[in-house]
């Protein structure tokens, strides 16, 4: 009971309500104020969570009732507030006060194993007392309320192998188990509350206990004897056969390795198939029937992983005997060497022996051999394997020959072997040196004595060696040529010097200088070479760079005055040609009379990113000439606008999009105003030809002989790209750029 300090306050019993009451309403207690002496009219009010729903108060008496079944496990405590009001005044007699309704526990919940399903793994053969797993049950009842939540564990199924500790739920092993006999066990555990007393509630759970494998079994061969055969031609790594051992263990504990006990392990090996654990006997080294026709092998098997404590179970490894029979094969010939390198000097006569190759039959019958040679017609081979030349060899033509020699057995031509033969041709000094290039040599008319005219060098087709050396000499026979002298630089070059001051182009325009070049080969070879020196009018600069252009005309005997006259004539002819071209175009006449055969011109298109050969595909001129569009005469004032409109039409070849048109027109404007644009007379053509040019065709293709008198002044309006056309066809057209 509670009263506040000034002797005013609430009076009530300690409020407890049992859970799970089945009555419609259950009286919990009565709220009373000690001011309520029976003469007053006091009204009691209940406030807070649960008031008016779970708990109802008789406001006249203060009696509190629970009108719902309560579950302590859902809610064990209700905190409510109470008020007392004097009916006469309508005012609260006391301050609002808080009180508690506690829900008392009954044993209405059975133990539950919340962590189900339980599964545990324990090694087989584990000793007694080994901990397997701990199971734990939960009871929702109040652990502080008697024994409602005090549990005891017991084993309903699983004896005699397992036991459970009553208070902890720890499951332990009670006797050793062999996985190879049974690999899993179902154990049923019961948990009882009320420490097992009468009226207790219980719950059960199942525990799956799996035995994990330990390596307590050794592998044993299925068979004690195996017989295999192998061909002597079998390559290394060939599978001869399979052997098999069984192990009652699983996983890593069943992994095994096979081995060969004796010396035959050099010839045979056993590898394991990891999927099947079979031993695959393979050939480690080639066998030869002629050498040994059968082998006896003793193989043994053991586990890969054995713990020390389990080693006693693995003593005396299982063994098996394998007999391998070698089968005879007709083997191909065998060359003594895998390949041959032979050498021969160049220039030897045909029939010269280069060298000999040899192959033998490895079989017992020792068949004779027949040889064939491929790779060059310069060599042949006889039945002894001797290779001879069939032509004289020139190192400067080919320094190496790659030949293939094939040997076949006479008794069985199907048995073939090949070997590579490399023939190196040695160099001999059989090529004289010569000028390394053609020299176009000039000397100025005003050259001075001692002036360098030409530096010459030589080459030799023979094999270049480090101490290769050339010697240069002025021929003694060249007595009439004392105008020049030769100096050997001793570095495989020589210098030609002027031996006099001044030359006369008119009197002696050309000099021929005979030069001897010798090499240092054994024997030494010498060649005679002629150097042509042309006299040139270099002017004051004494620079011979311009001489190459003048040379031809001067050599032909033309004088300076004649050359100038010829050039003027050429220019006049060109001017006349262009005048005729312009007049013909203005009258829309063909420049050339029409022939029976049309021209086919390659039109180069530059309107793509590059199409390789497609850029230069010839158009069918017939198609161009049979155009359905007639180029009708238009009024001159409209032609400029028409060209622009035709240009716009040509833009519509691609997608008809205002965005594309705007973009291309911007690019056109950009190109027209670009100071770095290409020369205006460069040809720019497009795949779409339009619907005809108001200017008419400028080519010989499909020209019409109408519109004789056209005015081309409108070309000036088309921008800088049409400047060249405007200047060619316009009448007194002024460039406007």
């Amino acid at each position: 009971d509670y009263k506040d300090d000034d002797d005013k306050g609430w009076v009530w019993n300690q409020f407890f309500v049992p859970e799970e009451m089945n009555t419609t309403s259950h009286h919990i207690g009565q709220l009373r104020s000690d001011l309520d002496n029976g003469n007053n009219s006091f009204q009691y009010k209940l406030l807070g969570a649960g008031a008016g729903s779970t708990f109802i108060i008789d406001e006249r008496t203060g009696d509190i009732y629970a009108i719902q079944k309560l579950d302590r496990e859902e809610r064990s405590l209700y905190i409510l507030r109470a008020q007392v009001i004097d009916i006469a005044t309508g005012r609260a007699v006391e301050p609002e006060s808080e009180f508690v309704i506690k829900v008392s526990d009954i044993n209405d919940n059975e133990p539950k194993f919340l962590d189900e399903p339980y599964e545990a793994i324990v090694p087989e053969m584990s000793p007694e007392g080994t901990l397997v797993i701990q199971v734990t049950a939960s009871d929702a009842d109040d652990p502080s309320s008697g024994n409602n939540a005090r549990l005891l564990y017991s084993l309903l199924q699983g004896q005699p192998y397992f036991s459970v500790e009553p208070t902890t739920g720890v499951i332990r092993i009670s006797s050793k188990m062999d996985r190879e006999l049974q690999d899993e066990y179902w154990v049923i555990i019961q948990a009882k509350d009320m420490i097992g007393q009468p009226g207790a509630l219980s719950g059960t759970t199942s525990v799956l206990i799996k035995l994990s494998d330990v390596n307590d079994n050794k592998p044993i061969f299925k068979e004690s004897f195996y017989r295999f055969t192998i061909s002597e031609s079998a390559p290394i790594g060939t599978s001869i056969g399979k052997i098999m051992a069984y192990d009652d263990d699983i996983g890593e504990n069943a992994e095994m390795e096979y081995s060969i006990e004796d010396d035959d392990s050099k010839i045979f090996d056993i590898i394991i198939d990891n999927d099947t654990q079979e031993g695959i006997v393979i050939l480690k080294k080639k066998v030869d029937f002629e050498q040994q026709s059968y082998y006896g092998i003793r193989a043994k098997v053991k586990n890969c992983h054995v713990d020390e404590e389990l080693a006693p179970a693995h003593v005396n490894a299982s063994t098996t005997y394998i007999k391998v029979q070698v089968e005879d094969e007709d083997e191909p010939p065998v060359f003594l060497l895998p390949y041959y390198i032979l050498e021969i000097p160049e220039g030897k006569p045909y029939g010269t022996i280069v060298g000999t190759v040899s192959a033998t039959d490895p079989d017992r019958r020792q068949s004779p051999m027949r040889y064939y040679l491929t790779g060059s017609k310069m060599f042949d081979i006889n039945d002894n394997g001797t290779i001879i030349t069939t032509n004289m060899l020139d190192r400067e033509v080919s320094a190496w020959y790659n030949l293939t020699v094939t040997a076949t057995e006479t008794y069985n031509v199907q048995q073939i072997s090949s070997a590579h033969v490399y023939v190196q041709v040695f160099n001999i000094n059989d090529n004289a040196p010569e000028f390394s290039q053609f020299y176009e040599t000039y000397v100025c008319e005003n050259a001075e004595s001692g002036e360098i005219v030409q530096i010459i060098s030589a080459i030799d087709r023979d094999e270049s060696i480090e101490d290769h050396h050339f010697y240069f000499n002025h021929s003694l026979e060249d007595t009439n040529n004392s105008s020049f002298m030769l100096t050997d630089n001793q570095d495989n070059t020589a210098v030609i010097l002027s031996n006099r001051t001044g030359f006369n182009l008119k009197e002696e325009p050309v000099f021929y200088m005979i030069i001897l070049i010798a090499d240092n080969g054994i024997p030494s070879l010498t060649s005679t070479n002629t150097l042509t020196i042309q006299v040139c009018d270099c002017g004051d600069s004494r620079n011979t760079e311009t001489c190459a252009n003048k040379g031809l005309l001067f050599i032909m005997g033309f004088r300076t005055e004649a050359i100038i006259a010829i050039m003027i004539c050429v220019m006049v002819i060109f001017g006349f040609f262009f005048l005729i071209l312009a007049l013909k175009q203005r009258r829309k006449e063909t420049l050339f009379p029409e022939k029976t055969e049309d021209f086919r011109e390659n039109i180069f298109c530059y309107d793509d990113e590059g199409g390789g050969e497609e850029d230069s595909e010839a158009f069918d001129i017939v198609e161009l000439r049979q155009s359905t569009v007639m180029r009708e005469r238009k009024p001159q004032r409209s032609k400029s606008a028409e060209i622009r409109s035709l240009y716009r039409q040509s833009l519509q070849v691609g997608p008809d999009s205002a965005i594309f048109r705007k973009f291309i027109l911007e690019k056109l404007e950009e190109a027209n105003t670009d100071p770095c644009a290409p020369p205006f007379d460069s040809l720019q053509t497009f795949a779409y030809e339009g619907t005809g040019s108001s200017a008419g065709s400028l080519s010989s293709l499909a020209s019409r002989d109408t519109d004789q008198e056209d005015d081309f002044d409108y070309l000036n309006d088309l921008g800088p790209r049409f400047k060249r056309l405007a200047s060619m066809f316009g009448s007194a057209v002024q460039p406007n750029n």
Epitope: T24, S25, H27, S41, K45, I56, E59, Y65, I87, G90
Partner: antibody, heavy 122, light 108 residues
């Protein structure tokens, strides 16, 4: 609409227990206070006591020692037991419902049964 | 207990007349928790007025109640033939609930 009907023996012997039942129809017994009132022949009305639907009771002190009022919400009924009856307990017994004009406190009786006459006689 | 005394014991009036019934409490009735009932022979009482002055549902407005503390009055402004019956006052401001002895209203 809510109607009340009293039922029970019309004749009770002295010193025995008078038992009456009031059946509520047309509405729920929940959330109301239910009273028993009696009227001796030719006399005024006397309040016997009430029961709240939750089971809370309050009796007239003059009869408290002999009166028990109970409720069965599942049957929508409430009952009166008056023990040790005498001839003075002969009366017309009414069951009535308090209105809810004033929540929580006592209120006037807005619905009455037709009454059942109980005679205490040997 | 609060004792209610009604007066007069019997009141003889004619239809159309005004009737005034009095109820006096032995002590103040808390919150004016006083009601008036009408009972006709062979019938259960019928609630007329609650809270001293509030008309119950379906009661004609010729019935009115007044008063507080210890003195309360029921007034029938214009008597109708069906109004002739016994009238009881009841207090419910304090337990136990008590009734007056009644006033018989008869036709003159």
């Amino acid at each position: 609409q809510v109607q009340l009907q009293e039922s029970g023996p019309g004749l009770v012997k002295p010193s025995e227990t008078l038992s009456l039942t009031c059946t509520v129809s047309g509405g729920s017994i929940n959330s109301y206070y239910w009273s028993w009132i009696r009227q001796p022949p030719g006399k005024g009305l006397e309040w016997i006591g009430y029961i709240y639907y939750i089971g809370s009771t309050n009796y007239n002190p003059s009869l408290k020692s002999r009166v028990t009022i109970s409720v069965d919400t599942s049957k929508n009924q409430f009952s009166l037991k008056l023990s040790s009856v005498t001839a003075a307990d002969t009366a017309l017994y009414y069951c009535a419902r308090e209105s809810r004009y004033r929540s929580g406190w006592y209120d006037a009786f807005d619905i009455w049964g037709q009454g059942t006459m109980v005679t205490v006689s040997s | 207990d609060i004792v209610l005394t009604q007066s007069p014991g019997t009141l003889s009036l004619s239809p159309g007349e005004r009737a005034t019934l009095s109820c006096r409490a032995s002590q103040s009735v808390a919150g004016s928790y006083l009601a008036w009932y009408q009972q006709k022979p062979g019938q259960a009482p019928r609630l007329l007025i609650y809270g001293a002055s509030s008309r119950a549902t379906g009661i004609p407005d010729r019935f009115s109640g007044s008063g507080s503390g210890t003195d309360f009055t029921l007034t029938i402004s214009r008597l109708e033939p069906e109004d002739f019956a016994v009238y009881y006052c009841q207090q419910y401001g304090k337990s136990p609930i008590t009734f007056g002895q009644g006033t018989r209203l008869e036709m003159k």
